[in-house]
């Protein structure tokens, strides 16, 4: 089986969505925005809704030049965001506190050059084992209604733990429909057992899956974004099964609980 | 076509600063990062530094202090100076561009300095 | 401090010979590597980046493998033009670094 990875990816995607089989995975990462290319499947909250306005002001988007959004991110510290290891590039920008897609100027955005990433040293690309990565930004943000850090939960999810999923990756699959706002979603942790059960011989500590029977799941474009449970971040949206939602095969999410010591140490290194 | 292209003077003074310039076509440069590399006479590639579009730059740990990296205001060229320069900085200095993957996939062709009196 | 490693720094093989360069990090780099290969009076040449993403136009004989702090370039079957120098380099950080590349090793025809 191979991975569908959850970004959006227009640059070096690592199965285009013509060459990539039903039942494989993928990481969620994509290429939205302006120059989203048609046949990239790469990115989405699938049967989700429209976030309330201000209520993830810890949400960030990763842009590709001019305005391709191909990873989200997490806000965790008002100089650093976290995202998924496997959403690291070289050059890219942040955008904090944008509500819509589209790159249209909203007065509660800040943008910001990432001046440092440093990935998980476990991480193995093109693997899922330890995927995260933290994020220096160039300066820190300014706090408001719209930009604001959220604190890391050192407490691993149990199942049947309600958690919310945002991003701005495709809502349909394996076609391709970009929203015009950041889309939200509910859904459940999944023990480890049903984890495993799901992608058997690749899950590990470092993951959780999460999802429901109602065909409702993250998808490319929105990795690296937000899993927040009970008020606080527990994981990043890394992987999935391609085409995403389908029964049986939930979404896969990287276990911050187990990273809170690497993220705090990081941090005070590099500040 | 994508293009890097290395000049500046084949010979400087010990002691004197090293002044080259890449010119580049075919793609923006607000797009990609850029690294400077040479290679002394025989030896292996040495990283000199990289310089992003937002104007960051990360120098080696030998090379800060002594070299300057930047971008014209035309955005079509990338520059390198190396001050107190001596024979050891004798080299092809190389301007490179980054895949945006971490790899240098576009080279120039590369120019010799040659550091003496 | 990141330092790469890289043997052997020279190898003799014949046309049609399996070759394998291995580079090792002194640290953990995750997938960060790329190889170039250099010819004499050439500018390198990307081959591999990520650690097994061969680069546009490579041929599939080349292939790299690994992860954390030790990582392979394989030819499978070596061909009269890739006798050359090859080199990996570490894209993991740039802080506090003295060379992102290793030392090189040179493919010499048996």
């Known amino acids: 089986v191979t991975e569908h990875v959850l970004a959006n990816n227009d640059v070096s995607c690592d199965h285009p969505s013509n060459t990539v089989p039903s039942g494989s995975n993928q990481d969620l990462g994509a290429g939205a925005g302006e120059d989203a290319r048609s046949d990239d499947s790469s990115s989405r909250i699938i049967n989700g809704s429209d976030c309330d306005m201000h209520t993830q002001p810890w949400q960030a988007a990763l842009l590709l030049r001019p305005n391709q959004l191909y990873c989200g991110a997490v806000l965790v510290h008002p100089q650093w965001l976290l995202t998924a290891a496997h959403c690291r590039k070289k050059v890219f920008r942040v955008r904090l506190g944008h509500y819509s897609l589209s790159p249209v100027y909203e007065s509660g955005q800040q943008m910001f050059q990432g001046v440092k990433s440093i990935p998980h040293p476990g991480y193995s690309h093109p693997g899922h084992s330890n995927d995260l990565m933290l994020i220096k930004l160039n300066r820190r943000i300014r706090p408001t209604k719209d930009v604001r850090p959220i604190n890391v939960s050192s407490h691993c999810p149990s199942a049947g733990t309600k958690c919310l999923v945002s991003g701005w990756g495709t809502t349909k699959s394996p076609q391709v429909h970009f929203p015009k706002v950041l889309q939200c979603l509910n859904i459940s942790v999944l023990s480890q057992k049903r984890c495993e059960d799901a992608y058997p011989r690749q899950i590990d500590d470092t993951m959780f899956c999460a999802g429901d029977k109602a065909g409702r799941d993250s998808c490319q474009g929105d990795s690296g974004g937000p899993v927040v449970c009970n008020g606080s971040l527990q994981g990043l949206v890394s992987w999935g099964d391609y085409p995403c939602a389908r029964p049986n095969r939930p979404g896969v999410y990287t276990n911050l609980c187990k990273f809170t010591k690497w993220i705090q140490e990081t941090i005070q290194a590099n500040s | 076509e994508v293009q890097l292209q290395e000049s500046g003077p084949g010979l400087v003074k010990p002691s004197g600063t090293l002044s080259l310039t890449c010119a580049v076509s075919?793609?923006?440069?607000?797009?990609?990062?850029m690294s400077w590399v040479r290679q002394p006479p025989g030896k292996g590639l040495e990283w000199i530094g990289d310089i992003y579009p937002s104007d960051i730059i990360d120098y080696a740990s030998w090379a800060k202090g002594r070299v300057t990296i930047s971008v014209d205001s035309s955005k079509t060229q990338v520059s390198l100076k190396l001050s107190s320069v001596t024979a050891a900085d004798t080299a092809v200095y190389y301007c490179?561009?980054?895949?945006?993957?971490?790899?240098?996939?576009?080279w120039g062709q590369g120019t010799l300095v040659t550091v003496s009196s | 401090a990141y330092q790469m490693t890289q043997s052997p720094s020279s190898l003799s093989a014949s046309v049609g010979d399996r070759v394998t360069i291995t580079c090792q990090a002194s640290?953990?780099?995750?997938?960060?590597l790329a190889w170039y290969q250099q010819k004499p009076g050439k500018a390198p040449k990307l081959l591999i980046y990520l650690a097994s993403t061969l680069a546009s136009g490579v041929p599939s004989r080349f292939s790299g493998s690994g992860s954390g702090t030790d990582f392979t370039l394989t030819i499978s079957s070596l061909q009269p033009e890739d006798f050359a120098t090859y080199y990996c380099q570490q894209g993991y950080t740039n802080s506090n670094i003295i060379n992102t590349f290793g030392g090189g090793t040179k493919v010499e025809i048996k």
């Open positions: 490179a561009r980054d895949n945006n993957d971490y790899g240098l996939d576009i």
């Open positions: 640290q953990s780099i995750s997938s960060w």
């Open positions: 075919g793609f923006p440069l607000s797009n990609y990062a």
